[in-house]
């Protein structure tokens, strides 16, 4: 016998969205009389957020049910129902068991960067030096594609001289030289960098933007003839 | 690394309620299950429940009418109160971070012990 | 609750030889949607904290000697230690994580024959 039942549902999903089943035997005849007639109800949810009844269970099939809007994984990522099982279809002996529903990520966070405005000091002539990290926080799952991070220079890099990767552990974005900066030409630049997920956003949602201001170090070069 | 530190008394009298405080370092407690778990001397390991950041519990249903566990994200740390403790809640007292939807337990403080005793 | 439980209570072998530790779910840790177990081994050195070694059953984790792998499903699983070492005589504790009610076994001790 399985006292125990796991099922997931999508974060954000509209009521009426079916979740799994739970399903009681009882050896009793249920064609001629109730005694093995089974009648599910949830008796209890933990935890009632955002309220008590966010599941429902169909009295006869044992399907359970969203009933509420409002699952939100990064608040509550797992319910925990007790189903009462009662034969003679509700009027007879119970028996408990434990429904544990996983409320899986949907990608209804954007990363934001914390801190939004960076400055950084580079070296001229210097190829892949690292310039900056920029950090971001995302409330998503952690290490899923609703979390990682995509980070893409919008503007300020007329010379195309930087590049941005994703740190896989971290989640940074690492800002490097691409090629060498010439301080006499330009010993200041200021970069617009912004951020996405790998995975597309589920609903509208505002991109965060970091401004960089890099500036270019002096080197003492040799004269040319 | 993320590193967890549990403090509090450890010595209680019986009746009276343990308090422990759990510090969590080198990480953010946003996002994850932190649960406490007890063990007697030279016994195994019991669950005693978990919190999740938005401050939502779960308890061990032996345990569940004495605890209380709270969750402060400002400060990084989350907090175990079991009143009207006894000789037999005389254990070490862990405090160990869990993933949502799986929930293994891959970072424990050191432990601390909390004995039970007039 | 699932009960777990495990087998032998204690175990001692050779240095360089093979250990076996069996762990029983009293129903299936296994949720069909992901075809995952949800079970967890952890080793525990007299006054430390319990180590994770394996989790979804046979996945090691970051840091884990390669000697160490987890097998089964269901209800049934075994954590071998393909070449014993000095340091791997601990306590070595299964537990499910498919109910909210988490519940680790007794505990197997591991020694040195």
């Known amino acids: 016998t399985q006292d125990t039942f796991r099922g997931s549902v999508l974060e954000g999903v509209l009521p009426g969205t079916s979740v799994m089943q739970v399903t009681a035997t009882d050896e009793d005849d249920a064609i001629y009389t109730y005694n093995g007639v089974v009648a599910y109800s949830i008796h209890s949810q933990e935890p009632k957020d955002p309220h008590d009844l966010m599941f429902t269970i169909h009295r006869s099939t044992g399907t359970i049910s969203v009933i509420s809007s409002g699952l939100d994984r990064e608040k509550v990522p797992e319910y925990t129902l007790t189903i009462q099982a009662t034969d003679m279809d509700g009027d007879g002996s119970t028996t408990t068991a434990v429904a544990v529903v996983e409320i899986l990520d949907a990608n209804d966070n954007a990363p934001m960067f914390d801190p939004q405005k960076y400055e950084a000091h580079v070296p001229e002539n210097a190829v892949g030096h690292e310039v900056q990290r920029l950090t971001v926080t995302d409330l998503d799952a952690p290490n899923s594609p609703a979390w990682r991070a995509t980070y893409l220079i919008m503007g300020g890099d007329d010379g195309d001289h930087f590049t941005i990767t994703t740190h896989p552990e971290s989640n940074q974005g690492i800002l490097t030289t691409r090629k060498g900066l010439d301080f006499e030409a330009k010993n200041q630049h200021t970069l617009y960098v912004e951020v996405t997920n790998e995975a597309p956003f589920v609903l509208k949602l505002p991109t965060s933007t970091a401004t960089i201001v890099v500036h270019v170090e002096d080197v003492n070069e040799a004269p040319v003839f | 690394q993320v590193q967890l530190q549990e403090s509090g008394p450890g010595l209680v009298k019986p009746s009276e309620t343990l308090s422990l405080t759990c510090t969590v370092s080198?990480?953010?407690?946003?996002?994850?299950?932190w649960s406490w778990i007890r063990q007697p001397a030279g016994k195994g390991l019991e669950w005693i429940g978990r919190?999740?950041?938005?401050?939502?519990?779960i308890y061990n249903p032996s345990l569940k009418s004495r605890v209380t566990m709270s969750v402060d994200t400002s400060k990084n740390q989350f907090s175990l109160r079991l009143t009207s403790v006894t000789a037999a809640d005389t254990a070490v007292y862990y405090c160990a971070r869990g993933n949502p939807l799986a929930t293994y337990f891959g970072y424990w403080g050191q432990g601390t012990l909390v004995t039970v005793s007039s | 609750d699932i009960e777990m439980t495990q087998s032998p209570d204690s175990l001692a072998v050779s240095l360089g030889e093979r250990a076996t530790i069996n762990c029983k779910s009293s129903?299936?840790?296994?949720?069909?949607?992901?075809?995952?177990?949800?079970l967890a081994w952890y080793q525990q050195k007299p006054g430390q904290p319990p180590k994770l070694l394996i989790y979804w059953a046979s996945t090691r984790e970051s840091g884990v000697p390669d000697r160490f792998s987890g097998s089964g499903s269901g209800t049934d699983f075994t954590l071998t230690i393909s070449s014993l070492q000095a340091e791997d005589v601990a306590v070595y504790y299964c537990q499910q994580y498919y109910s909210t009610m988490y519940t680790f076994g007794q505990g197997t001790k591991l020694e040195i024959k």
């Open positions: 080198g990480g953010s407690i946003s996002g994850y299950y």
């Open positions: 129903q299936s840790v296994l949720y069909s949607s992901n075809n995952k177990n949800y």
């Open positions: 919190i999740y950041t938005s401050g939502n519990t």
